[in-house]
C-alpha cells in the first residue's frame, strides 16, 4: 500500500508479485461516505499507471484487468474526481513482475591457502527482478551441514568463514546453492570435493636468489611455501623479454638450482605452488623477484678497423676503431679496452687502456711492420684479443673491387654493389665496406662506420648512421692475406637540389685567362652528393643567354680556369651546384673585366 488509504482501498489479484506475462485484476473501491457530496453517481474513479490514466468509472468501485506489465515494479494509483474540485488520491499499490530463479550454474568452491576459508561462487542466471534469497549449503561427513544465506540483490558469492583442514584430506564435502523467490525456487547441481580439490595454496613468498662464488653457473632460487605444497612451477625471463622459461619441480622444499641463466642480465622470477599432482589448482604467481646475474669474462672478439694517414716522409697516423661487443658477448660492464701496438721485427710493444672511447689514434714511423691487438675487459676478465697487421689497404691495385655503385634503398639505406677484383677473385678473404660523412676538409674526426662481408658477396646494405640528404664517402676494400685493394664512390640515401650555390671568393687573371676560386657549400646545404659545379658568365647589361662551363665535382677542388672571355669586356659570373635531384639557386654574382690584349 502506498499510503494510509483512508478514503478507499486498492486490491490486486491474484497477487502483488506476478510472473512475467500474467494478468492482474486491480479493484479500487471507496469506503462508505467517502465519495463526492450530493450524488454518488458523480463519483468518477480514475486508475493511473504511474502518471498515465488507464481506466475510469462512475460509481463506488472500479475494476480493471491489466496485462503486459514489464519486468520490475509498476505503481498504480486510484484517484477520485468530483465536479469543480481537484482529483483526490484514494489509494495505490505496487505490482512486482518477475520470473522464478533459474538453476544456479557452475557452482565452484575454493579455499585460498591452508588456513583460508571456504568460499563458493556461482552464476545466478537471468535477473529475476524480484527479491531472491540464496542459501548455500555445505555438507560433510557424519551429517555435518552448514547453511549460510545471502540477501544481496545480486548474490553470487558466499564465504562460509570456516576452513577445511588437511587432517582428513580425502573426506568428501558437497556444496549446493538454492535460489528462492515468491515465484519459485531452484537448486544448483551439487559440487562434491575434498580438501585437496579446493585448497588453492597461497603464492610462495620471501623469494631470494644466491649466486655461489659470484658465478652465474651456480645459482639457487629460494622461497617459502605453505607446509603441504608438493609441486612448484618456476618461471623466469630476462626483464626485456616477453617469453618465459618454465620449470616444474616436485618436492623442491623451497629451493631450486637454475643452470641456464645468462650473465649480467636482469631477470624476473615468479613461483607458483600446488598441493597435489592431479588434484586442486595452482596458486597465483608469487610477486616478482628481480635480480641481476653476475658478470662473466667477455666472449667473442672485437670487430676492429683502422685508417692510415700520411703525415710526412717519416711518419704516419694510425686511427683504430672498434665496435662494442654485444650484450651477450660483453657479459658485464666493459671497464676498458686494452690496445697493444707492436713493431713486429723489433719486438717492442706499447700497451694502453682506453676508457670511454671505441677509437684510438697514434703516430708511428712509416718504416717497419706494425700490428695491433685490441681486447675488452670487464670485472671478470678480458675478451680474446683481435689482432690486425697494419698495411696499406689500397696498395694492391689488382685487388681493387670493380664497378662500385651506391644506390638509395628506401629510407636511410644505401645499397653498395661491386664486382670482384680482376686478380683471382678466389684470393679475396673478405670485403670491408666503409663509410663516413663527406667533409671537404677530409676531417679525420668524422666517425667511421664499416661492415664486413663474406668473399662471395658482391653487395652490402648500409643503414647504420645513415642520414637523409648527407653525402657519404664509401670505400669497398678487398682483403687478401697482408694485401688490400680498394675502390671508392660517393653515395646518399636521399637527395634534393642543393639549397645554395658556391660562393665565389676571388677571380684572378693569369696570362689571358681567369682563375675562379670559390668556397664550398656548407655540408648541411648540399642536400646529398654533389655531381657538378656550373660556372655561368655573360656580358654585363646583355640580355643574351649566359655561357656556362660544367665541372665534375671533386672533393678538394675549389678553383677552375676559364679562358674564353674577351678582354676589356665586363662580365657577370656566378656559380651553381648540382646533385642528381637538380640544380641549386645562384651563388653570389661577381663582375670581372679581363685586362689582357685583344687578338
Amino acid at each position: 500500500k502506498i499510503d494510509a488509504c483512508k478514503r478507499g482501498d486498492v486490491t490486486v489479484k491474484p497477487s502483488h508479485v506476478i510472473l512475467l506475462g500474467s494478468t492482474v485484476n486491480i479493484t479500487c473501491s471507496l469506503k462508505p461516505r467517502q465519495g463526492c457530496f450530493h450524488y454518488s453517481r458523480r463519483n468518477k474513479l480514475i486508475l493511473y499507471k504511474f502518471d498515465r490514466r488507464i481506466n475510469f468509472h462512475h460509481g463506488h468501485s472500479l475494476n480493471s484487468q491489466v496485462t503486459g506489465l514489464p519486468l520490475g515494479t509498476t505503481l498504480f494509483v486510484c484517484k477520485l474526481a468530483c465536479i469543480n474540485s481537484d482529483e483526490i488520491q484514494i489509494c495505490g499499490a505496487e505490482i512486482f513482475v518477475g520470473v522464478a530463479p533459474e538453476q544456479p550454474q557452475n557452482l565452484s568452491c575454493i579455499q585460498k591457502g591452508e588456513q583460508g576459508t571456504v568460499a563458493c561462487t556461482w552464476e545466478r542466471g537471468r535477473d529475476t527482478h524480484l527479491y531472491t534469497e540464496y542459501t548455500l549449503q555445505l555438507s560433510g561427513p557424519k551429517n555435518l551441514t552448514w547453511q549460510k544465506q545471502c540477501k544481496d540483490i545480486y548474490c553470487d558469492y558466499l564465504d562460509f568463514g570456516i576452513n577445511l583442514t588437511p587432517e582428513s584430506p580425502e573426506s568428501n564435502f558437497t556444496a549446493k546453492v538454492t535460489a528462492v523467490n515468491s515465484l519459485g525456487s531452484s537448486s544448483s547441481l551439487p559440487s562434491t570435493f575434498t580438501f585437496l580439490d579446493i585448497v588453492r595454496p597461497l603464492p610462495p613468498w620471501d623469494i631470494r636468489i644466491k649466486f655461489q662464488k659470484a658465478s652465474v653457473s651456480r645459482c639457487t632460487l629460494y622461497w617459502r611455501d605453505e607446509g603441504l605444497v608438493l609441486l612448484n612451477r618456476l618461471r623466469y625471463r630476462p626483464s626485456n623479454s616477453r617469453l618465459w622459461n618454465m620449470v616444474n619441480v616436485t618436492k623442491a622444499k623451497g629451493r631450486h638450482d637454475l643452470l641456464d641463466l645468462k650473465p649480467f642480465t636482469e631477470y624476473e622470477f615468479q613461483i607458483s605452488s600446488k598441493l597435489h599432482l592431479y588434484k586442486g589448482s595452482w596458486s597465483d604467481w608469487s610477486e616478482s623477484l628481480r635480480a641481476q646475474t653476475p658478470e662473466e669474462e667477455p666472449t667473442g672478439m672485437l670487430d676492429v678497423w683502422y685508417m692510415k694517414r700520411h703525415i710526412d716522409y717519416s711518419r704516419q697516423q694510425i686511427s683504430l676503431f672498434w665496435k662494442n661487443l654485444s650484450v651477450s658477448e660483453a657479459r658485464g660492464k666493459i671497464l676498458h679496452y686494452q690496445v697493444t701496438l707492436q713493431e713486429l721485427t723489433g719486438g717492442k710493444a706499447m700497451t694502453q687502456n682506453i676508457t670511454g672511447h671505441t677509437s684510438w689514434t697514434t703516430v708511428i714511423p712509416r718504416t717497419g711492420n706494425w700490428a695491433v691487438a685490441v681486447s675488452a675487459a670487464n670485472s671478470k676478465g678480458s675478451s680474446l684479443p683481435t689482432r690486425i697487421n697494419i698495411m696499406n689497404l689500397c696498395e694492391a691495385g689488382l685487388l681493387a673491387p670493380r664497378q662500385v655503385s651506391a644506390n638509395s634503398e628506401g629510407m636511410d639505406n644505401i645499397l653498395v654493389t661491386w664486382q670482384p677484383p680482376r686478380k683471382d677473385p678466389s684470393a679475396v678473404q673478405e670485403y670491408v665496406v666503409e663509410w663516413r660523412e663527406l667533409h671537404p676538409g677530409g676531417d679525420t674526426q668524422v666517425p667511421l662506420n664499416w661492415l664486413r662481408s663474406r668473399p662471395y658477396n658482391v653487395s652490402a646494405l648500409i643503414s647504420e648512421n645513415i642520414k637523409s640528404y648527407i653525402c657519404y664517402e664509401i670505400r669497398v676494400y678487398a682483403l687478401s692475406g697482408d694485401q688490400g685493394g680498394c675502390s671508392s664512390i660517393l653515395g646518399n640515401s636521399k637527395h634534393k637540389a642543393p639549397l645554395s650555390g658556391p660562393h665565389i671568393n676571388a677571380i684572378t687573371e693569369e696570362k689571358g685567362s681567369i682563375l675562379i676560386s670559390w668556397n664550398s657549400i656548407p655540408v648541411q646545404e648540399q642536400m646529398g652528393c654533389l655531381l657538378h659545379y656550373r660556372i655561368y658568365w655573360k656580358e654585363r647589361d646583355s640580355n643574351s643567354q649566359p655561357q656556362l662551363c660544367e665541372i665534375p665535382y671533386r672533393v678538394s677542388q675549389n678553383s677552375h680556369p676559364i679562358n674564353s672571355l674577351q678582354p676589356r669586356v665586363t662580365y657577370v659570373l656566378w656559380m651553381t651546384a648540382l646533385t642528381a635531384a637538380g640544380e641549386s639557386s645562384h651563388g653570389n654574382e661577381r663582375e670581372f673585366c679581363l685586362q689582357g690584349k685583344a687578338n
Partner: nanobody
Framework: QVQLQESGGGSVQPGGSLRLSCGAS????????MHWFRQAPGKGQEWAAT????????YYSDSVKGRFTISRDNAKNTLYLQMNSLKPEDTALYYC????????RGQGTQVTVSS
Amino acid sequence: QVQLQESGGGSVQPGGSLRLSCGASGFTFSSFGMHWFRQAPGKGQEWAATISSSGGTTYYSDSVKGRFTISRDNAKNTLYLQMNSLKPEDTALYYCARDVTGAVRGQGTQVTVSS
C-alpha cells in the same frame, strides 16, 4: 604439535546450564574455524556447532539450535560452548576439534544430564 584441552563438563539436571571451554595451542588459533562434536554412549560422533575464525559466523546442528551458543576468544586461544535448557539426550562426551571431521580433537569432557 596441535593440542586441544576441554574442560567444564559435569552432571546437571534437565533444564540446567553448563559452559564448556577448550584451550588450544600449537597452531595459529585465530586462523582456523573451530568445532564442537559430541559422542553419546554406544553412538557415533555427532557434530554440534561451528564458529568461523573471526567469530563472526556460527553454525548449529538442528538438535542444539536455539539452546547452545558457540563463541571464542582469540586473545586467549580459547573456544567456548554455552549449553542451556539441557536435556537427557544431551548426555555425551563433548570435545572440540580444529578440523571439520573431528580427526584432530581433544580428549573430551563428559556432560551428564539426568534427574
